[in-house]
């Protein structure tokens, strides 16, 4: 094919592969009607002038996972038709000015996981065609005004995984095309008021993993077209009440891992795209009336590993759509008979690690289609007559770690747990703590005449009868429903991602604990 | 008879970590709680965590990213892995049973207790 | 977390004589359902484990001298020894398990 480097493979498709330790500088004669060139995994440590002068047609550059540290500032020489430049993960610490000059076809430059320290105005001003930079994963500290000035035609800018400890309010402003701006994983600690304001096209911001403390009040009141905003794992400890205000469009929003210890009614909203809401790893200790009433078509809402104590009958008010709450490992000693009642549609609710000591009889008495609740690990010594009665598809119950008082009045509750074994599960089942004599047998099978009778005999002898519901799945066969949703938690597609599995009370529904918001 | 014996302690290097043992006899972990507490020498009792009878546990929230919990049923024991030690830590480590008491967060039966020092 | 603080540090009282130890929660530890104060009082002798001594702030654990009496409500607590004996000197802590529990800094007590 026009004469193919021994050390390289080529395509009929104009496609040259160039790969393997042995390659210590660019291959030649490369064909001269190559298109697409991809070096990778060699030990080219440096690019010399002009090594691709007679392969003028090149459209995809690709000189990855190499040991290159030093290029001459006229290595692309001659390449005009360049679409696609690659130098990620090699060893540079410094561009060349006027290394891209000439490119003027260049549409995607991607120098991520390098030793880049520093960009320059210059670096880039020739690049006007340029709709994707990726400068992640590289030491960066700061970024200059007007670094970005001339690629008024950038979609998508990606600078996370830096050192960048400031943002400069006048660096993004002519990025009007600007779709995609990702800044995550940097040592953050505040963002001036107008830094995104010129970004009105802009569709995803992605801010996790900072040390950012507080956000202005108009951040994002420009980004009218905002869909994705990632906000976890900084150091947030209030929304100032207008913060949110003005995303209609937005449908993912990730706020775990701050330190917000309050959210006031209508900070969210109006969303009403909005479909999850990501609060888990924070230090909220109540939830008033009407502080998701804006979120209408919320169907995912994570509020774990928090400190609420108290929640208000209203605060689930306008969650018509939810289908799962999260609440496990709070500080929750009381729950208000009606704080469910909005909740049509729920089907799965995690309330165990909590300090629950009782429940009200009608707390799930409008949420008919629960499929799964979660109540382990709370301090529960019984629970009212017929409150699970009407769950016709609940196929999940979890009631083990509870300190179950085994008299005569659990013999109702006892009743109902003998016909709906299958939904408890066989792993680990119900066992009682008091009186000491029946400590530790199980709840279903236990003689309860041998317990201490209690003073109180209940009138009717046990729940009404609810053994299986034609309508619910068999047990074990289905995939219990509470590990569909929140088994990991809200994942970008950009990141590689490290998942560590927790499995006691600081996991989140027993979910993955993903690295990114 | 009710017994619970602590081993695994001894001297920590800072940044090390340890894991410690309660081994029970007399009655089942299917069945009970047992808890961690540690003590400084001259100083008070701190609360680290306990595992209850379904494997769930609960930590001393200032402790909880250093310290997991765990047990084996079938080998009666419960284990205490504690990460990142510094010489704040070193103390006496118990662990502690709700045996008779009605009191679920009661320890009524208690180990001697197993010595930790870190210290380089 | 609640903190709970004890008085006083250390307590010397004749053979016979009454000891009254007392300890103050940061929040009410009553749970207006259970109406249970949700405070447990140990006992620590030199060299030994601790011994539960009281727990629900006034019940008294199996086999414990009704010597030892515990009263109190919602922050405020106190454990009284009636007529000390010997057998008595240890360190004594008030621990509450409204929340994840906590231990008082413990008090001393001493024959005068």
């Known amino acids: 094919y026009h004469g193919c480097p021994s050390e390289c493979t080529c395509s009929r498709a104009s496609q040259v592969e160039c790969t393997g330790a042995r390659i210590v500088a660019v291959p030649t004669p490369l064909p001269w009607n190559a298109m697409s060139l991809q070096i990778l995994n060699t030990h080219i440590t440096e690019l010399n002038e002009s090594p691709f002068l007679n392969i003028s047609a090149l459209i995809a550059l690709r000189i990855e996972k190499n040991e290159l540290s030093r290029i001459t500032p006229g290595a692309f020489r001659n390449l005009g038709s360049l679409r696609y430049l690659s130098l990620a993960n090699n060893k540079l610490q410094v561009l060349p000015i006027g290394l891209f000059q000439g490119l003027d076809s260049l549409e995607s430059l991607l120098l991520s996981s390098n030793q880049l320290l520093q960009i320059q105005p210059a670096h880039f001003s020739q690049c006007s065609n340029l709709k994707e930079l990726q400068l992640h994963g590289n030491h960066l500290e700061y970024i200059p005004d007007g670094a970005f000035d001339h690629l008024v035609g950038l979609t998508k800018l990606n600078l996370g995984k830096n050192s960048l400890t400031h943002i400069s309010p006048r660096v993004f402003q002519h990025l009007g095309n600007l779709q995609v701006l990702r800044l995550y994983e940097n040592r953050l600690t505040d963002i001036p008021m107008g830094t995104f304001d010129g970004l009105v096209n802009l569709q995803e911001l992605a801010l996790q993993q900072n040390q950012i403390g507080l956000l202005s009040p108009g951040l994002f009141h420009n980004n009218h077209n905002l869909q994705r905003l990632y906000l976890s794992n900084n150091h947030i400890s209030q929304l100032p009440p207008s913060v949110f205000m003005q995303l209609p469009q937005l449908n993912r929003l990730t706020l775990f891992g701050n330190s917000l210890k309050e959210l006031s009614p209508g900070i969210f909203g109006p969303m009403p795209n909005l479909r999850e809401l990501w609060l888990y790893d924070n230090h909220i200790s109540s939830l008033p009336d009407n502080v998701f009433s804006n979120l209408r078509q919320l169907q995912v809402l994570i509020l774990s590993r928090n400190q609420i104590s108290f929640i208000s009958p209203g605060a689930f008010n306008g969650l018509t759509e939810l289908r799962e709450l999260s609440l496990h490992t709070n500080a929750l000693q009381d729950l208000d008979g009606n704080v469910f009642r909005m909740l049509a549609n729920l089907q799965n609710i995690s309330l165990q690690n909590n300090r629950l000591r009782q429940l009200p009889g009608n707390i799930f008495a409008n949420v008919n289609g629960l499929m799964a609740i979660q109540l382990q690990n709370n301090q529960l010594e019984n629970l009212p007559l017929g409150i699970f009665d009407h769950l016709g598809k609940l196929c999940e119950l979890r009631l083990y770690d509870n300190p179950w008082r085994c008299d005569s009045d659990i013999l109702p509750l006892r009743n109902w747990l003998l016909l709906n074994q299958p939904r408890l599960g066989t792993d680990t089942v119900p066992v009682c703590f008091s009186p000491a004599n029946v400590r530790g047998q199980s709840l279903i099978i236990i003689n309860v005449n041998v317990a201490v009778p209690s003073v109180h005999v209940p009138e009717v002898p046990s729940y009404p009868e609810t053994p299986w519901y034609p309508d619910t799945p068999s047990y074990p066969d289905t995939t219990s429903v509470s590990s569909t949703t929140e088994l990991t938690s809200p994942v970008e597609d950009y990141t590689d991602l490290t998942t560590i599995q927790v499995t006691d009370d600081r996991s989140v529904w027993g979910m993955t604990q993903a690295q990114s918001g | 008879e009710v017994q619970l014996v602590e081993s695994g302690g001894g001297l920590v290097q800072p940044g090390g970590s340890l894991r410690l043992s309660c081994a029970v006899s007399?009655?089942?972990?299917?069945?009970?709680?047992v808890h961690w507490v540690r003590q400084a020498t001259g100083k008070g009792l701190e609360w680290l965590g306990v595992?209850?009878?379904?494997?769930?546990?609960n930590y001393n929230s200032a402790l909880m990213s250093r310290l997991t919990i765990s047990k084996e049923n079938a080998k009666s024991s419960v284990y205490l892995q504690m990460n990142s030690l510094r010489a704040g830590d070193t103390a006496m480590y118990y662990c502690?049973?709700?045996?008779?008491?009605?009191?679920?967060?009661?320890?009524?039966?208690w180990g001697q207790g197993t010595t930790v020092t870190v210290s380089s | 977390d609640i903190v709970m603080t004890q008085s006083p540090d250390s307590l010397a009282v004749s053979l016979g004589e009454r000891a009254t130890i007392n300890c103050k929660s940061s929040?009410?530890?009553?749970?207006?359902?259970?109406?249970?104060?949700?405070l447990a009082w140990y006992q620590q002798k030199p060299g030994q484990s601790p011994k539960l001594l009281i727990y629900?702030?006034?019940t008294r654990e199996s086999g414990v001298p009704d010597r030892f009496s515990g009263s109190g409500s919602g922050t405020d607590f106190t454990l009284t020894i009636s007529s000390l004996q010997a057998e008595d000197v240890a360190v004594y802590y008030c621990?509450?398990?409204?929340?994840?529990?906590?231990f008082g800094g413990g008090t001393k007590v001493e024959i005068k």
């Open positions: 502690a049973t709700h045996m008779i008491t009605e009191d679920y967060y009661g320890m009524d039966y």
């Open positions: 007399g009655f089942s972990l299917t069945s009970y709680g």
């Open positions: 595992i209850w009878a379904g494997g769930s546990t």
């Open positions: 929040q009410s530890l009553l749970n207006s359902r259970t109406r249970k104060n949700y």
């Open positions: 629900w702030a006034s």
């Open positions: 621990k509450q398990s409204y929340n994840h529990p906590t």
